[in-house]
Amino acid sequence: ISYDSPDYTDESCTFKISLRNFRSILSWELKNHSIVPTHYTLLYTIMSKPEDLKVVKNCANTTRSFCDLTDEWRSTHEAYVTVLEGFSGNTTLFSCSHNFWLAIDMSFEPPEFEIVGFTNHINVMVKFPSIVEEELQFDLSLVIEEQSEGIVKKHKPEIKGNMSGNFTYIIDKLIPNTNYCVSVYLEHSDEQAVIKSPLKCTLLPPGQESESAESAK
């Protein structure tokens, strides 16, 4: 492989590490759009044990601009020294490097969820993976926000054990024939900025208490 003098410095790539469906996903964007690589290779090492850069197997010669690092990056303490190489054919166009600390740099994407409206309550079904590694729990708590007529109420359901499998939460004591919107997100213990899901809305049907109790059965 020929190595042309890189057109970009470390400043030429923007990286983002996210916890998406409890998977550690590193994504990147190029600031200079004039040169488009045909493929990328991602390498890393750990600062506390500086060894040769290791190629991430599922992110070698990849055409995607993201990489799943769940099985590679486990420690929230370590610095992961990351190098992204961009290629056009056999020519290296650029190399960007960046250090990541999961405890600081990880952003937490909201889980997938569905809502079903009944007369006076809403069932919120939150979808978590069936198994979530302990290291990927990150002291997170689930927040469900209910909005109606400009009023926002926060629900913090207590989840026994860790966040895995599907979870259902009932928002009750609602007013029939009223529009409610729901958003879910993951909140970190140190109250860092959260990423809220788009709102999902439902107009509750009109009806009696007894009907809603029947429909919930």
């Epitope: 929230t76 303490h77 610095a79 250090n99 600390w101 600081i104 302990e134 290291e135």
Partner: antibody
């Protein structure tokens, strides 16, 4: 050799704000975290927060939420801690420290004394 | 937050004699990555802190081998085999396993 040079003594009025700087030299600034620690006179140490100068990502102790803003300038290899709405409780020596992994703090600055007094 | 308790508060020693400081945490400091993030630092009078020991027992470069760190789980100890004048000051243990990191209250090592 690794050095963290902090800004000088600050004597400020209650209700105002102050910005403490920490200039790093002798290593690659964006390869390490900068952490901040508070020490009140005659007392122990209290961790404030940390910043990844490469990404600008920060993590702070809840105790200091709304009080402290951490930033870093890569071009000058300098980290900053901005303290707002100062009260006498903020009178302390503030240290910056370098970390290769979270909470490692292997090198420390000389400290910046902040006194809040009317 | 994890509470770090150091004993004794003050330790009066004679130069050349051994010294021992205890540090106990309110929770285990063994992280899910298998490491124990327990460190020790020394703050000499009028100076900034200096890290001596990290990951329970690893000595920082330039730290004399008369210092040893040991322990696991919630109980940790810093020992000085023969105290020298330059060792005087306040010793702090701190944990970095759990957020936020927390410090012990300090142990002042002084001359008898």
């Amino acid at each position: 050799q690794v050095q963290l040079q902090q800004s000088g003594v600050e004597l400020v009025r209650p209700g105002t704000s102050v910005k403490v700087s920490c200039k790093a030299s002798g290593y690659a600034f964006t390869n390490y975290l900068i952490e901040w620690v508070k020490q009140r006179p005659g007392q122990g140490l209290d961790w404030i927060g940390m910043i990844n100068p490469g990404s600008g990502g920060t993590k702070c102790n809840k105790k200091f939420k709304g009080k402290v803003t951490l930033t870093a300038d890569k071009s000058s290899s300098t980290a900053y801690m901005h303290l707002s709405s100062l009260t006498s409780d903020d009178s302390a020596v503030y240290f910056c420290a370098r970390s290769g992994w979270v909470y490692a703090m292997d090198y420390w600055g000389q400290g910046t004394s902040v006194t809040v007094s009317s | 937050d994890v509470l770090m308790t150091q004993t004794p508060l003050t330790l009066s020693v004679t130069i050349g004699q051994p010294a021992s400081i205890s540090c106990k945490s309110s929770q285990s400091l063994l992280d899910s990555d298998g490491k124990t993030y327990l460190n020790w630092l020394l703050q000499r009078p009028g100076q900034s802190p200096k890290r001596l020991i990290y990951l329970v027992s690893k000595l920082d470069s330039g730290v004399p081998d008369r210092f040893t760190g040991s322990g696991s789980g919630t109980d940790f100890t810093l020992k000085i085999s023969r105290v020298e004048a330059e060792d005087l000051g306040v010793y702090y243990c701190w944990q970095g396993t759990h957020f936020p990191q927390t410090f012990g209250g300090g142990t002042k090592l002084e001359l008898k």
